[in-house]
Interface confidence: low
């Protein structure tokens, strides 16, 4: 099984114990590590952070001691903007320039492949996204002719049914991608006006979502139905939680909220907590399991957080094995307890390790 793990370059800027550099990563934990994110400037793939080249080096030296580890560079992301990707992908010359720029950049910096994180193609971009993937793969095949190992090509896709329908020609893009990471999280947010888990495995009877699409099981099943081969589908598991501020004394699933939860001490983003911040939160909190959804949530005062723990990630891994998927994807290593100092287990990356162990279990 693949264990595809994202590392985010901006995690270096978190203060104190939240700051994470690639040299803190475990070289034997994941089969693939994806560095997020690269930029595109003047239609060429490019660095994003001022010290990306240094960090690329840190990451890729992990392979010195684990030659089986594959590293990929992810291009795009939330801050890149869908419009910029659209302009490049829809223009034949821009697309060609971008595609040509990728292999030398990856080779120079020691990466084994490219991950496309176009979040998200619009309805009009659907065909262009397919073309981009098809042509990128053709370039990778051509570039590898002189006996080089062919560069890998993957994509991170939304798990939302509406986005899947409008953005992706699943059957076609699946032919050209080495694997597909389906982002089976962020199904529920403060916009719903109620509490709810952002990454349920199933639609439980407790689910407050107005649809039956907002769960991992549906998204995976839908992707398979649309023609994604199980052997290429990698299922996303979050090492972060989504939090809400309760608006009343109700604390269950579907309770009214006044907005996102208060920012974490290190991640500093309202409505989001890293797993290591959740471990802090759990001291003195009340933990509940949403049985049908097979995930936990915790409450403390007027704060509510839906997250994944070692038990829920094991359920998710069992599920992906049952559906004979290619493996698991983790967003993100730097949101797990990467120091092993927050969650009281004396274990670095407890969630990712639980995923790895469950994948290896017979």
């Amino acid at each position: 099984y693949k264990l595809v793990c994202y590392y985010t370059s901006w995690s270096q800027y978190r203060e104190g114990d939240g700051s994470c550099f690639p040299d803190a990563l475990d070289r034997f934990l994941c089969t693939h590590i994806i560095y997020s994110f690269a930029n595109i400037s003047n239609d060429h793939i490019d660095t994003w952070e001022w010290n990306d080249v240094t960090l690329y080096g840190m990451l890729n030296t992990l392979k010195n001691r684990n030659p089986n580890l594959k590293t990929l560079l992810s291009v795009g992301g939330w801050n890149f903007g869908s419009q910029r990707f659209s302009k490049i992908a829809s223009n034949t010359q821009s697309r060609r320039t971008f595609i040509k720029s990728v292999p030398p950049f990856l080779r120079t910096h020691g990466f084994d492949g490219l991950d496309l994180a176009w979040l998200y193609p619009g309805r009009r971009d659907k065909q262009h996204f397919t073309t981009l993937i098809k042509e990128m793969k053709a370039e990778f095949i051509k570039e590898a002719q002189p006996g080089k190992k062919q560069l890998l090509l993957s994509a991170a896709l939304s798990a939302g049914k509406v986005t899947i329908d409008s953005s992706y020609d699943i059957a076609k893009i699946s032919q050209h991608l080495d694997f597909i990471s389906i982002m089976t999280y962020d199904f529920h947010g403060a916009w719903r006006g109620t509490t709810g888990h952002h990454s349920p495995l199933f639609r439980g009877q407790e689910d407050a979502s107005p649809d039956r699409f907002s769960n991992t099981d549906y998204a995976v099943g839908y992707m398979l139905r649309l023609g994604a081969p199980a052997s290429k589908l990698v299922m996303g598991i979050p090492t972060f939680g989504r939090s809400f501020t309760l608006a009343s004394s109700e604390t269950g699933v579907g309770a009214p909220i006044s907005g996102p939860g208060i920012p974490g001490r290190f991640t500093k983003e309202a409505g989001t907590l890293a797993y290591y911040e959740i471990c802090d939160f759990l001291r003195g909190a009340t933990v509940h399991r949403i049985l049908g959804q097979q995930v936990p949530y915790a409450t403390k005062g007027n704060q509510w957080v839906g997250y994944d723990d070692q038990e829920s990630v094991k359920s998710k891994v069992q599920y992906l094995k049952d559906r004979q998927l290619a493996g698991a994807m983790v967003w993100a290593l730097d949101l797990d307890d990467f120091q092993g100092s927050f969650c009281g287990q004396d274990l670095r990356f407890p969630l990712t390790n639980a995923i790895k162990d469950a994948l290896a279990a017979t």
Epitope: F202, R203, D211, R212, N215, D217, G221, Y222, L224, D322
Partner: antibody, heavy 119, light 109 residues
């Protein structure tokens, strides 16, 4: 909330019949799969087909493809068209709606309608 | 195609006793299994979903469990009203295939 089947009765071998499932107290919104299941006298349950109202997708048991067609005909009715009927198709036909649980879990069943294929 | 093999076909037990019904899946379906109870002349009634979760209004005397591809329905403190035929059903969606097991008749003495 309830569902009720109609349209059953006696039919000649090689004949055709259309069964209707009518909902009361709810409409076939995008949240539901509607399914047909049959049960021959003294035998077990046998799944025939489902329709997913969200996108109109249809699903059939391999043996039912070609002879049975499931359709949504209105916001409160689903039909099952059956052709080339034989004595082996004699059964009580149930219409069932799925629950908002994981997978297609049938928690709302009609009382059934009996179809007898005989000359 | 998925095949669910239910055993035994029939079982007899006394009031207050315990009955165990097995359902073996031919392929891996994870927790995608439901159990139904059916009495003569009536449609089936949902008991258990996601292998082990009790449907609303169902007595806690009914318990579902799973070990690999083998699923078990246990009825404890048997009552006369439990006399019925019990069916397992696989519940995948996304790739819908709703196989039923052959059924197990429970006779209560």
């Amino acid at each position: 909330q309830s569902v009720k089947e109609s349209g059953g009765g006696l039919v000649q071998p090689e004949g055709s019949l259309t069964l209707t499932c009518t909902a009361s107290g709810f409409s076939f919104s995008s949240s539901y799969y509607m399914c047909w299941v049959r049960q021959a006298p003294g035998k077990g349950l046998e799944w025939i087909a489902c329709i997913y109202n969200g996108d109109g997708s249809t699903y059939y048991a391999s043996w039912a493809k070609g002879r049975f067609t499931i359709s949504k005909t209105s916001s409160t009715t689903v039909t099952l068209q059956m052709t080339s009927l034989t004595a082996a198709d004699t059964a009580t036909y149930f219409c069932a709606r799925d629950a908002d649980y994981a997978g297609v879990v049938l928690n709302l069943w009609g009382p059934g309608t009996l179809v007898t294929v005989s000359s | 195609a998925q095949v669910l093999t239910q055993t035994p076909a029939s079982v007899e037990a006394a009031v207050g006793g315990t009955v165990t019904i097995k359902c073996q899946a031919s392929e891996s379906i994870g927790n995608a299994l439901a159990w139904y109870q059916q009495k003569p002349g009536q449609p089936p009634k949902l008991l258990i979903y996601v292998a082990s979760y009790l449907a609303s209004g169902v007595s806690s005397r009914f318990k579902g469990s799973r070990s690999g591809t083998e699923y078990t329905l246990t009825i404890s403190d048997l009552e006369c009203v439990d006399a019925a035929t019990y069916y397992c059903q696989c519940t995948w969606y996304g790739n819908v295939y709703l196989a039923f097991g052959g059924g197990t008749e429970v006779v209560v003495k």
